[in-house]
């Protein structure tokens, strides 16, 4: 069956049952997700607006899918397996009386079961499993997943163990104000800009002149040197780092376990062996991947490549190319393209270069 092909999953509570305090609903749902994140590499984050992977809905009777609820008792809730649109969504029958305790129907216990479905689990034949098809109250303070539940979810996503350490080659620190300095990759991370070169990165905090040099391994011991491309999805606190045909996911500045993964999971053809540069545009919710003289566009919501790509860089980014080393997005309208020791400020609304700079101009050189 289907699984989520990523480890950072968002959820949104569409509406609240009047049976409970909002805070209790939030807490029950958060703890239910935590049950599954404790035994997998998955990380769940609640968002309050926009399109989440998993939508939590309280509804009665007919509610927009084929599976109308049946009033009090009977079907308590249902959830769809991983996927886009309705995929992953969890629906709770508003005709039940939802509670934080043993009276009525316990929201936390029901949510743990439904989120199991949202993550791709089917029903279990083990009566001790939370994925057993019938509801039975157990003390929520001592609640544990059964061995069968854990086996099932880990067969889909693995366990939460850390990656193994990877060796780093020993390069000397490049001179920051060398006029010939080029970068391997550049990305924003919140209000900072990370510039990668060999086994080092420089950190530039927006609007402050001071920069600091760091070893990549000092911040992320499991990552290799020579990062070749990087991009950030700030709304998700995610940074993607690329080297050769692999990529790593950083969430909230921490490497996600079970990485690296193959770049081909993004949908690149087999001949693509590495990414030169990448940039995410939050206005379009698309990531642009630059490979040699071409680029691909990837839909981050639907997690698939847009049709009609690759395209030539020179054809669609006037004055840029044929190849680039690095790129990042800033100030809501600019891409900063790096080619060797030169940098181009490119207004993607006007679709033209607005400034030419040295690559290290950010450092007051």
């Amino acid at each position: 069956g289907p699984v989520w092909r990523k480890h950072y999953i968002t959820y949104r509570i569409n509406n609240y049952t009047p049976d409970m305090n909002r805070e209790d609903v939030d807490y029950a749902i958060r703890k239910a997700f935590q049950v599954w994140s404790n035994v997998t590499p998955l990380k769940f984050s609640k968002i309050n607006t926009g399109m989440a992977d998993i939508l939590v809905v309280f509804a009665r009777g007919a509610h927009g899918d084929f599976h109308a609820f049946d009033g009090k008792g009977g079907i308590l809730a249902h959830a769809f397996g991983p996927g886009s649109g309705i995929g992953g969504d969890a629906h709770f029958d508003e005709d039940e009386f939802w509670t934080t305790h043993s009276g009525g129907t316990n929201l936390f216990l029901t949510a743990v079961h439904e989120i199991g479905h949202s993550l791709g689990l089917g029903h279990s034949s083990d009566p001790k499993a939370v994925m057993f098809p019938t509801y039975k109250y157990v003390d929520i303070n001592t609640f544990r997943l059964s061995a069968d539940d854990i086996r099932g979810i880990q067969s889909l996503y693995g366990d939460p163990k850390e990656n193994q350490r990877l060796p780093n080659p020993d390069n000397s620190e490049p001179a920051l104000c060398d006029p010939n300095l080029s970068f391997d990759a550049v990305t924003t991370v919140g209000n900072k800009i990370f510039f990668f070169k060999d086994r080092f990165f420089w950190l530039k905090v927006s609007e402050r002149p001071k920069t600091s040099v760091n070893l990549i391994s000092s911040l992320w011991p499991t990552l290799p040197s020579g990062i070749e491309a990087a991009y950030e999805i700030e709304a998700r606190n995610q940074v993607f780092l690329f080297k050769d045909d692999k990529y790593w996911l950083i969430s909230n500045l921490r490497p996600e376990p079970n990485y690296p993964k193959s770049i081909h999971s993004f949908g690149f053809p087999n001949f693509v062996k590495k990414i030169d540069a990448a940039v995410f545009n939050p206005r379009f919710y698309r990531t642009y991947f630059f490979v040699d003289n071409q680029y691909w566009r990837y839909d981050e919501r639907r997690q698939m490549m847009d049709p009609g790509y690759p395209k030539l860089i020179t054809k669609n980014f006037q004055g840029i190319g044929p190849k680039i080393d690095a790129v990042f997005y800033s100030k809501n309208k600019y891409y900063y393209f790096f080619q060797g020791s030169n940098q181009f400020e490119y207004d993607f609304l006007l679709q033209r270069i607005t400034k030419t700079l040295k690559s290290n101009s950010w450092f007051g050189c």
Epitope: G1, L55, H63, G64, D65
Partner: antibody, heavy 122, light 103 residues
């Protein structure tokens, strides 16, 4: 490439029976919910029936309940619609359509066959 | 049962026009609404799912919006191949269709 090909349509008298088939290829048929949707001449689309990947869950529109039976043979990658007690108002092009994977139907019809015409007339 | 009301039932427009079709549900269906295009003698084709997500291979001039009860399909700049009938749908309920004709 996903392909759906309906067959079995034709002219039948009121009260008669007909069995439609839909041959599927290009995807793991047994994973997906499948549906029948019909369209009377010059009219809009009307959902008729749906069946889960395993065949264990079925659903019907009120207008056909008790008269039509949806089934599938996953070993043959084929979907069926057995239509009994046919009426003039069942005259339509019948399309089979693919839905999503999973225990519940989303009603998201991403691939459709070309349709087969059923005419109920005396 | 939930009812879907689509408007207008027919619409005349010219190539290059911006066109909007609306669909209203009788009660909240969250974002569980899909849009299809059908040309004469052909099977319907999925354009937009989950109210606003563009189906793979569909041109970006098509867009969808809305949640709850009110939904919109917009074609930003009509092309000759866009003249067709458009249906909204949630679960087993289709709107009655909007026929888009050349002015």
């Amino acid at each position: 490439e996903v392909q759906l090909l309906e067959s079995g349509g034709g002219l039948v008298q009121p009260g008669g029976s007909l069995r439609l088939s839909c041959a599927a290829s290009g995807f793991t048929f047994s994973d997906y919910w499948m549906h029948w949707v019909r369209q009377a001449p010059g009219k809009g689309l009307e959902w008729v029936s749906g069946i889960s990947g395993s065949g264990g869950s079925t659903m019907y529109a009120d207008s056909v309940k008790g008269r039509f039976t949806i089934s599938r043979d996953n070993s043959k990658n084929t979907l069926y619609l057995q239509m009994n007690s046919l009426r003039a108002e069942d005259t339509a092009v019948y399309y089979c359509a693919r839905d999503i994977v999973g225990p519940y139907s989303a009603g998201l019809f991403d691939y459709w066959g070309r349709g087969t015409l059923v005419t109920v007339s005396s | 049962d939930i009812q879907m009301t689509q408007s207008p039932s027919s619409l005349s427009a010219s190539v290059g026009d911006r066109v909007t079709i609306t669909c209203r549900a009788s009660q909240s269906i969250y974002t569980y609404l899909n849009w299809y295009q059908q040309k004469p003698g052909k099977a319907p084709k999925l354009l937009i799912y989950a109210a606003s997500s563009l189906q793979s291979g569909v041109p970006s001039r098509f867009s969808g919006s809305g949640s709850g009860t009110d939904f919109t399909l917009t074609i930003s700049s009509l092309q000759p191949e866009d003249f067709a009938t458009y249906y909204c749908q949630q679960a087993g309920i289709f709107g009655q269709g909007t026929k888009l004709e050349i002015k």
